[in-house]
């Protein structure tokens, strides 16, 4: 089958600081040197691009300075971290991988990771 399979965890719980990390792994049908990874958020049938980065195999992922995502790569595996999450950001986060160079191009889309975000309870006032 000429397709690229992308695997990612089904569920991740964000930390109390609003940080969620997950691994996006792809089975490359070709020997790509340039890869683009995009994180998409699907909620209520609306899809928005959360962040995207293009990297050369063996090099680090570089997201834009104002991106809420950071990541590292190791072979056909990308470790993604999304920060600044709040309860309203709960949703399905889909990993999209594209093998950009050399040709042929391949597209792979994961099934998504459901990220649950719970806003921390405000600390009660202390009487001293």
């Amino acid at each position: 089958c000429k397709a690229m399979h992308v695997a990612q965890p089904a569920v991740v719980l964000a930390s109390s600081r609003g940080i969620a990390s997950f691994v996006c792994e792809y089975a490359s049908p070709g020997k790509a040197t340039e890869v683009r990874v995009t994180v998409l958020r699907q909620a209520d049938s609306q899809v928005t691009e959360v962040c995207a980065a293009t990297y050369m195999m063996g090099n680090e992922l570089t997201f834009l300075d104002d991106s809420i995502c950071t990541g590292t790569s190791s072979g056909n595996q990308v470790n993604l971290t999304i920060q600044g999450l709040r309860a309203m950001d709960t949703g399905l986060y889909i990993c999209k991988v594209e093998l950009m160079y050399p040709p042929p191009y391949y597209l792979g889309i994961g099934n998504g990771t459901q990220i649950y975000v719970i806003d921390p309870e405000p600390c009660p006032d202390s009487d001293f």
């Epitope: 089958c1 000429k2 399979h5 683009r36 950009m100 191009y105 889309i109």
Partner: antibody, heavy 118, light 108 residues
Framework: QVQLVESGGGVVQPGRSLRLSCAAS????????MHWVRQAPGKGLEWVAV????????HYADSVKGRFTISRDNYKKTVSLQVNSLRAEDTAVYYC???????????WGQGTLVTVSS | EIVLTQSPGTLSLSPGERATLSCRAS???????LAWYQQKPGQAPRLLIY???SRATGIPDRFSGSGSGTDFTLTISRLEPEDFAVYYC?????????FGPGTKVDIK
Amino acid sequence: QVQLVESGGGVVQPGRSLRLSCAASGFTFSSYGMHWVRQAPGKGLEWVAVIWYDGSNKHYADSVKGRFTISRDNYKKTVSLQVNSLRAEDTAVYYCARGGIWGYFDSWGQGTLVTVSS
Amino acid sequence: EIVLTQSPGTLSLSPGERATLSCRASPSISSSYLAWYQQKPGQAPRLLIYGASSRATGIPDRFSGSGSGTDFTLTISRLEPEDFAVYYCHQYGSSPFTFGPGTKVDIK
């Protein structure tokens, strides 16, 4: 709403060149791959070329490789197809199409007709 | 290169009838990356189905897609007068991106 408008078609002699353009509006242009697809009179659809995101990666159909060049200007929101060494078999309606977020071609222009004839 | 073959080449039916269009991929492809388009004379193609079975926005529910691997099907449950057109399958999972030769659905 998404709009793609092609221009630049016309009648041209074999061996000559033409530059096709596609003006985009209604979406974040730099976030999408842009394709050219052609259709010869009475025939089916044939994918021609794609240019990705920042323009650094381009892929072509074997039938046009070395003769056609795709480019984009993300500031002007335009994608162009420079068609050189034209042959009779290049006669077709040339469509500009957006590669959607999931990869399929979700928006198409109305097309521009290129006729190669002596 | 992934080759898509469509059958039949022409389908002659009456309004209200059911249309079943076939698309075969060689080698096999993931259903995530198969789309169907409708094209009427003098118009650009219009996306109907993506991911083999998901209807595009604004497409009536009489259009449905199914299939996996090598065999895919587009079904029009009850043909309306505006459905008589040419239908193309398309794979977008790898380059070169390819289209089937099309199936023409015409009025009997």
